[in-house]
């Protein structure tokens, strides 16, 4: 059995040149004739040189999975799906996203260090000593309140709560 060159495919014991992206094999090569290719029908594609008898079906972006169509399918490129705002891609296969997850909400005591994008989750960071955050979408930790000379510190601040001052 012969081993075919790159971008050739085996038919019986003959190697045939592959079709161009956007096409599929209509008729395999023969002794005198090269591979005859045909354009991919609508909603199908081939992204690479290929020996396929049928083009591949275009992907569908499922809104129930948090997906929206970012780039329509063409004869040589699959549909590109992206996550809806507020979600990021959990399963990425090349340029194709299959499932999305909601961006993490930073817990109390943390701030948003990096906002979530369509392909990356939110990155949270701890508040430094002397600052606090209630969490959520807060990008900066707030400094603890300094009780005034006429106030008494009842409870020291934590990374998630402010200092509590009393007026007595």
């Amino acid at each position: 059995q012969p081993s075919c060159r790159q971008e050739e495919f085996l038919v019986g014991d003959e190697c045939c040149p592959m079709c161009n992206p956007g096409y599929h094999v209509k008729q395999v090569c023969s002794e005198h004739t090269g591979t005859v290719c045909a354009p991919c029908p609508p909603q199908t594609y081939t992204a690479h040189a290929n020996g396929l008898s049928k083009c591949l079906p275009c992907g569908v972006c499922d809104p129930d999975m948090g997906l929206l169509t970012w780039q329509e399918c063409s004869s040589w490129k699959d549909t590109v799906c992206r996550c809806i705002p507020g979600y990021f891609c959990e399963n990425q296969d090349g340029s194709h996203c299959s499932t999305c997850l909601q961006h993490t909400t930073c817990p109390p005591g943390q701030r948003v260090e990096k906002r979530g994008t369509h392909d990356q989750d939110t990155v949270c960071a701890d508040c430094l000593t002397g600052t606090f955050s209630l969490g959520g979408t807060q990008e900066e930790c707030l400094p603890w309140t300094n009780c005034s000379a006429f106030q008494q510190e009842v409870r020291r601040g934590t990374n998630s709560t402010d200092t509590t001052c009393s007026s007595q």
Epitope: E7, E8, N20, C29, T33
Partner: antibody, heavy 117, light 108 residues
Framework: EVQLLESGGGLVQPGGSLRLSCAAS????????MHWVRQAPGKGLEWVSS????????DYADSVKGRFTISRDNSKNTLYLQMNSLRAEDTAVYYC??????????WGQGTLVTVSS | EIVLTQSPGTLSLSPGERATLSCRAS??????LAWYQQKPGQAPRLLIY???NRASGIPDRFSGSGSGTDFTLTISRLEPEDFAVYYC??????????FGQGTKVEIK
Amino acid sequence: EVQLLESGGGLVQPGGSLRLSCAASEFTFSSYAMHWVRQAPGKGLEWVSSITSASSYIDYADSVKGRFTISRDNSKNTLYLQMNSLRAEDTAVYYCARGTRGLFDHWGQGTLVTVSS
Amino acid sequence: EIVLTQSPGTLSLSPGERATLSCRASRSVGKYLAWYQQKPGQAPRLLIYLGSNRASGIPDRFSGSGSGTDFTLTISRLEPEDFAVYYCQQYGSSPPITFGQGTKVEIK
């Protein structure tokens, strides 16, 4: 000897139309795939379109897709190329050629198409 | 599409000399490559098909070799009538059918 004779070329304005014909003789026209190949002045060869013997399969170059239509009449031994929405870059000598799929074993002498205002 | 690159662009030789023309494909075309000769004001003429088969009526000083991506047209001894432009063309995967940009063989 195989003979292919193109006609229908000429001067046409951008956006205009032209229909080229290729009269074939001295071979069984209905048994062969036929092709159009063009050559811009001083440039190389560019495949334009192909049609199989029974018109069951037709191909076009991307540069002419949607504007040009290849057809044949086996009873008249004639190949046609209907050219619409012509552009300056379509200016070329248009050759009709006989052959198996993708191979051109006999060529006509060509007809010049000039697209200019 | 498969791109064919011919080299050199121009070959300056004397009658009786050997001419070697190259055609390289951007990806494999198998054995499905043809060579054509074109003289000024004339239609192209098929010389070689399937990489190495001479077309009907072509003198045996013309020979073709190669497969896959690298092909060569050799004219063993140049005759005065051989000075012309030579084109390679692939039909390994079509459409589209593609031609090389041509090599001009001129008298030195």
